[in-house]
């Protein structure tokens, strides 16, 4: 329930004045913040009208005003000069007009004694759809049908009935003739411009005699939505642009200088490289809406954004447009990790994934951002279990270290390993980050072997060799499932002679099973961690036979085989191959309430960066 | 001196209707608020709605949330009556209904008895089965 209050209905008439009272709780964040009056459209936006930090619409330019009363905790908006086409539905609030606290309040003005007047006010946004009625009478119902616009002082021919159409309005007018009953016709101007706007007239007949309306148009230009996000973040754009506009191209354009828009993303497939892999294209809904996520959030992202629909899939006169000015805080809540990770062919990498530590409970998701069409994000790992098929022993998603941070791994590496993977959760939205691994010349650090058989009954020891540079690491051996990777007994067997010039402080530490059984098949991993902060991981997968003849096995570097490519699922696994990030659990609206993130206090271990914010494979 | 008399309510059924109406006498000005209040048995009294106008014909409505959808308010023009319709009620609508009156206009907080000089005796609204 929103601690804003005001009058619900308010009713006035033609050219009288209005004050609208909103009562807020007077904290001094309340006190200060800002006060706005916006409009609440059709499709659900709210287009701000007058706010406290000096924004005046121009449809309010000269007869509107808001006063905040800090000390008695009010604002006031008088507003003069009414007319009908104030009625309508707005909100008086505090903050963020989508985000912030509010009141509805809907404002009906009614036409005043002496006020008739012949012109009839349309008020259209840009790139939308104006509708004329234009009444005639009977004797006039098999004359000629126009429209003009007054153009100066002279009256310029727009369509008319017998097929003219002006050049201005080619392929975006029509007149509409309605059935012998009713004495009206229409013209439909599609794709407004912001030119259409002003005085038209329109005529049944061409002699004393004919009926004339007059029309004034009004085109606005969308007021843009002022978003707040974190540096790092992440940002959503829900662009609602009608089902008029269902089948045309979509794009979101970020502007420049003058009235450039450059293109950020379309659904004719261009991606501007600065967004690359870090933007995605939500398919459109039936009444043509779609959403653009925006991840990895820079300063330099920071700007006025709009989004639009033309066959083009740019910006271009007539385009219906939704309009953004997104501000990047710097003073981000979200803590830096690196944004570039490498790894070597045949190594592991682990990722530190940020959420938000308020919501320690929600799922944790990884998933592989892909650029073909307009961007997806198919799931690959999630903190339930599952996993999706391909990664089967090779990927982990672990809830440590936790406390605002967790920890996804991958190993056995290989170059179509390359690209830009999302971390996110069910919870919050703006907390889903991008990093990108990199594949780089060199060698796995850890060695084993690779596939490996163990005999029904019998022992098996399989060895793994850490270099010196792990000297101070906690040593692991796992066995690895959908849920993690379960710590096994390991033990140290001394120094290693896997590595040259290495000395006395490398390692082999073996992982034994006693009397194999059929459960012990499967991946194992080794790998190094500092605490509850994960390095690098090394994976061997261990297939069970029947005995052939008695004894242990003792695995070494020399007689190990390749890891098999393909692995037979288990019957129970849970595979869901188009589990992807347009999963509609993971676009949860934002919740239109007062943003109150606490700033993230750097209990998590922090990654030198350094200015690229990368991070090696091998260095954790 | 204004004089404020309430009218109009009784027993009434779950998901039933009442309208109740206040008269003011006396004193008038151009500008008022007048609003309903309510007092359950044992509990502090409550704003329910109200409706300010100016002299030049401009009204402001104000429900709380409660009662937002279910309960109208409305003035005659002819003279100086407010009425509060009453549809959809609920047991926990049970109450002596008070109205109230303020030359204050539309510069204060009309939630608050505060801001009300003018009060009437009540009008008991029971909705039971």
């Known amino acids: 329930k929103s601690p804003i209050f005001g009058p619900e209905e308010v009713n006035s008439v033609e050219g009288n004045s209005v004050s609208i009272t909103c009562y807020y709780p007077p904290t001094s964040v309340n006190r200060h913040t800002r006060k706005y009056w916006c409009r609440q459209g059709a499709r659900g936006g709210c287009i701000t009208l007058i706010s406290s930090e000096g924004y005046v619409s121009s449809k309010y330019a000269g007869r509107a005003n808001l006063t905040n009363f800090p000390e008695n905790g009010t604002f006031v908006v008088n507003i003069a000069q009414l007319s009908q086409d104030d009625s309508g539905r707005y909100k008086c609030g505090l903050g963020i007009n989508s985000r912030g606290l509010s009141f509805d309040v809907s404002l009906e003005v009614s036409q005043g004694p002496g006020l008739l007047n012949d012109t009839k006010v349309y008020t259209v946004d840009l790139g939308r759809t104006v509708t004329i009625n234009c009444p005639f009478k009977t004797e006039n119902a098999q004359k000629r049908k126009s429209l003009y616009k007054q153009i100066g002082l002279y009256p310029v021919l727009v369509i008319d009935s017998s097929g003219y159409v002006n050049p201005n309005y080619t392929g975006r007018i029509r007149l509409d003739i309605q059935g012998t009953g009713q004495l009206l016709f229409s013209v439909v101007i599609n794709q407004l411009r912001l030119s259409d706007a002003g005085q038209y007239l329109c005529q049944a007949g061409d002699d004393s005699n004919s009926n004339k309306k007059n029309a004034d148009l009004q085109v606005l230009k969308p007021e843009p939505e002022l978003v707040y996000e974190d540096l790092r973040g992440s940002v959503t754009f829900h662009c609602a642009l009608g089902p008029e506009v269902a089948n045309v191209a979509k794009f979101l354009c970020r502007q420049s200088s003058g009235e450039n828009c450059d293109v950020v993303v379309n659904t004719l497939g261009k991606r501007a490289p600065a967004f690359e892999g870090r933007i995605l294209l939500n398919p459109q809904d039936k009444d043509g809406s779609f959403s653009v996520v925006i991840t990895g959030l820079r300063k330099e992202d920071a700007g006025r954004y709009l989004c639009g629909a033309h066959s083009d899939g740019q910006l271009q006169e007539g385009s219906p447009i939704q309009a953004w000015q997104l501000f990047v805080n710097e003073e981000s809540t979200i803590p830096r990790s690196p944004t570039v990770v490498k790894g070597v062919a045949g190594g592991s990498v682990a990722v530190l994934c940020p959420y938000n530590r308020k919501e320690s409970k929600s799922i944790k998701y990884w998933c592989l951002w892909e650029g073909a069409q307009n961007g997806r994000c198919p799931l690959l790992v999630d903190s339930e279990g599952w996993v999706k098929a391909q990664y089967e022993g090779r990927l982990s998603l672990l809830e440590e270290p936790g406390n605002g941070t967790f920890t996804v791994i991958l190993n056995q590496l290989t170059s179509r390993d390359a690209g830009f993977y999302w971390c996110l959760t069910n919870g919050d939205t703006l907390w889903r980050t991008t990093v990108e691994i990199k594949i780089i010349e060199g060698e796995p650090n850890l060695k084993v072997p690779g596939n490996v058989t163990a005999v029904l009954g019998e022992t098996l020891k399989v060895p793994c060799h850490f270099p010196c540079k792990f000297s101070s690491y906690e040593k692991y051996w796992c066995k690895w499932n959908n849920t993690g990777c379960q710590a096994l007994p390991s033990q140290d067997e001394g120094p290693s002679k896997a590595f040259v010039n290495c000395d006395e402080n490398s390692r082999l530490v073996s992982l034994t099973l006693n009397l194999v059984t059929r459960a012990d098949e499967g991946w194992y991993w080794c790998g190094v961690k500092q605490g509850h902060f994960y390095g690098e991981t090394a994976a061997v997968y261990v297939a069970v036979e029947e005995r052939k003849a008695a004894g242990s096995r003792d695995v070494s570097l020399a007689k190990a085989d390749a890891a098999p490519d393909e692995k037979v699922l288990d019957s129970g696994f849970r595979e869901i191959e188009n589990k992807a990030i347009q999963d509609p659990r993971l676009f949860a609206e934002e919740k239109a309430v007062a943003d109150t993130r606490d700033q993230a206090d750097g209990s998590r271990a922090s990654v030198d960066s350094g200015s690229s914010e990368e991070q090696g494979g091998s260095s954790r | 001196e204004v004089q404020l008399v309430e009218s109009g309510g009784g027993l009434v059924q779950p998901g039933g209707s009442l309208r109740l109406s206040c008269a003011a006498s006396?004193?008038?000005?151009?500008?008022?608020?007048m609003g309903w209040f309510r007092q359950a048995p044992g509990e502090e009294r409550e704003f329910v709605s109200a409706?300010?106008?100016?002299?030049?014909?401009?009204?402001?409505?104000y429900y709380t949330d409660t009662v937002k959808g279910r309960f109208t308010i409305s003035r005659d023009n002819a003279e100086t009556t407010v009425h509060l319709q009453m549809n959809s009620l609920k047991p926990e609508d049970t109450a002596v209904y008070y109205c109230?009156?303020?030359?204050?206009?539309?510069?204060?907080?009309?939630?608050?008895?505060?801001?009300?000089?003018?009060w009437g005796q009540g009008t008991l609204v029971t909705v039971s089965s």
């Open positions: 006396g004193r008038t000005f151009s500008s008022y608020t």
């Open positions: 409706i300010s106008w100016s002299s030049d014909g401009t009204y402001y409505k």
């Open positions: 109230a009156a303020s030359s204050s206009g539309t510069y204060g907080d009309p939630r608050s008895e505060r801001e009300y000089r003018y």
